[in-house]
């Protein structure tokens, strides 16, 4: 391996180095790890409430958005999938399945039919779904 | 790998973990892990050369596609992205970095463009590109 | 209004199995929101899950309990089961059948009248 | 699993008293926490939902609070029916679990 201080002038380039590498978990064996958090994509289609009951089976739910900076290997993923948010009519709001409110600027929610629950697409959007219909989707599960 | 007890007590946490539950790596911090392998995407735009130097200045290489078992997460990737394949004029094979040979039926290869190298694309698809176009790249460091 | 009925034996014999049914009467049992629950309450004592079955025959069991459980859907009957093999009078209680109407994570919002079993030679 | 605590274990109340019932969660639940009313020789009955979402046809006097581990029933002004069993509920994670109940008496 070359050293980075000889590509480094070679390319002229600022290339930073990790100091150090660590282990990320502890995760479900065979789950995608990214900053401490877990994730894993379903290719089943389940309806919204099916996905929601399977993610709880593997402790862990549907995904949760909660930082564009933590999260942001979210901005390559391809397709639709169900996630853990949903339209409280009471009060119009967007929430998560913990109950917390959707913060602003997190997901550009698009209305793509009319429904309660959410698929999440790429580059942070969330498109409006009728929670009966089958989609793949994604749990998560955020380690302590 | 290291098993959890012994990151426990490395740690000095007092984590119980599920028998089911491993952690993943070790891997650069903030890179994402998945089955013991290490993955970035870079978002900066760089031709075949500088991407390859990126990685290895990052003690990486550029995605090599092995097993599409062991790295189903590649399927979900929107976009495309370099990886470590190039084209060997001499005996017309496709190789890695590391020399070994494109296993057959592991990526379908598609001539985009006149070029030695390939670009990345969802579902195991390799496209064919000049090495000096920039593109986003994937870097890829396999655990022991 | 969707109405709920436990049936099914009021003594089992120690080492046997106990076999319920819940009967869904007033509305759907295959509405895609619905999921149907066996809990259990020992005399005197709280409240116990045992397990939730989806129409679609997905189940959900309580670990402690898994290996003697089975929850099983009929919908052209418009029934779920509960089986619980070797018991022992540990396994004596009131059986209520419940649903949640929004979801497995929604509260049990309506609830059977409730079967008492005695696990007794 | 996820241990519930309730407190007090029994309460004993004059009518018109405000009544406050506490339910504890060994670890984060969110709001994913309901509550259960259950006289004796019945069946239990919803009250709150979600911490603190109001049930259609249950008295307003009943009202719920909280977030994460630490929730509250509140009965506003007691009144002779409420005498029974208070337990509540976690939805969050498997296995279901619910809390040893609060039992309230009239004196």
């Known amino acids: 391996i070359w050293s980075a201080v000889f590509l480094n002038s070679l390319f002229n380039q600022e290339v930073q180095i990790p100091l150090t590498e660590s282990y990320c978990g502890p995760c479900p064996k065979n789950w995608i790890c990214y900053k401490n958090n877990c994730y894993q994509f379903f290719n089943e289609s389940k309806n919204w409430y099916e996905s929601q009951a399977s993610c709880m089976s593997q402790n862990a739910s549907l995904l949760k958005v909660y930082s564009k900076e933590d999260q942001d290997l979210l901005k390559l993923v391809k397709s639709y999938h169900w996630m853990g948010l949903v339209h409280i009519p009471t009060n119009g709001s967007w929430q998560w399945e913990d109950g917390s409110i959707l913060s602003p600027n997190l997901l550009t929610i698009i209305e793509m039919q009319k429904g309660d629950c959410a698929l999440y697409a790429s580059s942070f959007k969330g498109y409006i779904e009728n929670c009966s219909i089958p989609n793949t989707y994604i749990c998560m599960q955020r380690t302590v | 790998i290291w098993s959890a007890v012994f990151l426990n007590s490395l740690f000095n946490q007092e984590v119980q973990i599920p028998l089911t539950e491993s952690y993943c790596g070790p891997c650069p911090k903030n890179w994402i892990c998945y089955k013991n392998n290490c993955y970035q995407f870079f978002n900066e735009s760089k031709n075949w050369y500088e991407s390859q130097a990126s990685c290895m200045s990052q003690n990486a290489s550029l995605l090599k596609v092995y097993s599409k078992e062991d790295q189903d997460l590649l399927k979900l990737v929107k976009s495309y992205h370099w990886m470590g394949l190039v084209h060997i004029p001499t005996n017309g094979s496709w190789q890695w970095e590391d020399g070994s040979i494109l296993s057959p039926n592991l990526l379908t290869i598609i001539e985009m463009q006149k070029g030695d190298c390939a670009l990345y694309a969802s579902s195991f698809k390799g496209y064919i590109e000049n090495c000096s176009i920039p593109n986003t790249y994937i870097c890829m460091q396999r655990t022991v | 209004q969707v109405q709920l009925l436990e049936s099914g034996p009021g003594l089992v014999k120690p080492a046997e199995t106990l076999s319920l049914t819940c009967t869904v009467s007033?509305?759907?049992?295959?509405?895609?929101?619905?999921?149907w629950d066996w809990i259990r309450q020992p005399p005197g004592k709280g409240l116990e899950w045992i397990g939730s079955?989806?129409?679609?025959?997905?189940?959900y069991y309580d670990s402690s309990l898994k290996t003697r459980v089975t929850i099983s859907v009929d919908t052209s009957k418009y029934q779920f089961s509960l089986r619980l093999s070797s018991v022992t009078a540990a396994d004596t209680a009131v059986y209520y059948c419940?649903?949640?109407?929004?979801?497995?994570?929604?509260?049990?919002?309506?609830w059977g009248q409730g079967t008492l079993v005695t696990v007794s030679s | 699993e996820i241990v519930m605590t309730q407190s007090p274990d029994f309460q004993s109340v004059t009518p018109k008293e405000k009544v406050t019932i506490t339910c504890r969660a060994s670890?984060?639940?969110?709001?994913?926490l309901h509550w259960y009313q259950q006289k004796p020789d019945q069946s239990p009955k919803l009250l709150i939902k979600?911490?603190?979402q109001s049930i259609s046809g249950v008295p307003s006097r009943f009202s719920g609070s909280g977030f994460g581990t630490d929730f509250t029933l509140t009965i506003n002004s007691l009144e002779a029916e409420d005498a029974a069993a208070y337990y509540c509920?976690?939805?969050?994670?498997?296995?279901?679990?619910f809390g040893p109940g609060t039992k309230v008496e009239i004196k």
């Open positions: 509920h976690q939805s969050n994670s498997f296995p279901f679990t």
């Open positions: 670890q984060s639940i969110g709001n994913n």
């Open positions: 419940a649903r949640h109407e929004f979801g497995i994570r929604d509260a049990f919002d309506i």
């Open positions: 079955i989806y129409h679609s025959g997905s189940t």
């Open positions: 979600y911490a603190s």
């Open positions: 007033g509305g759907s049992i295959t509405s895609t929101s619905y999921f």
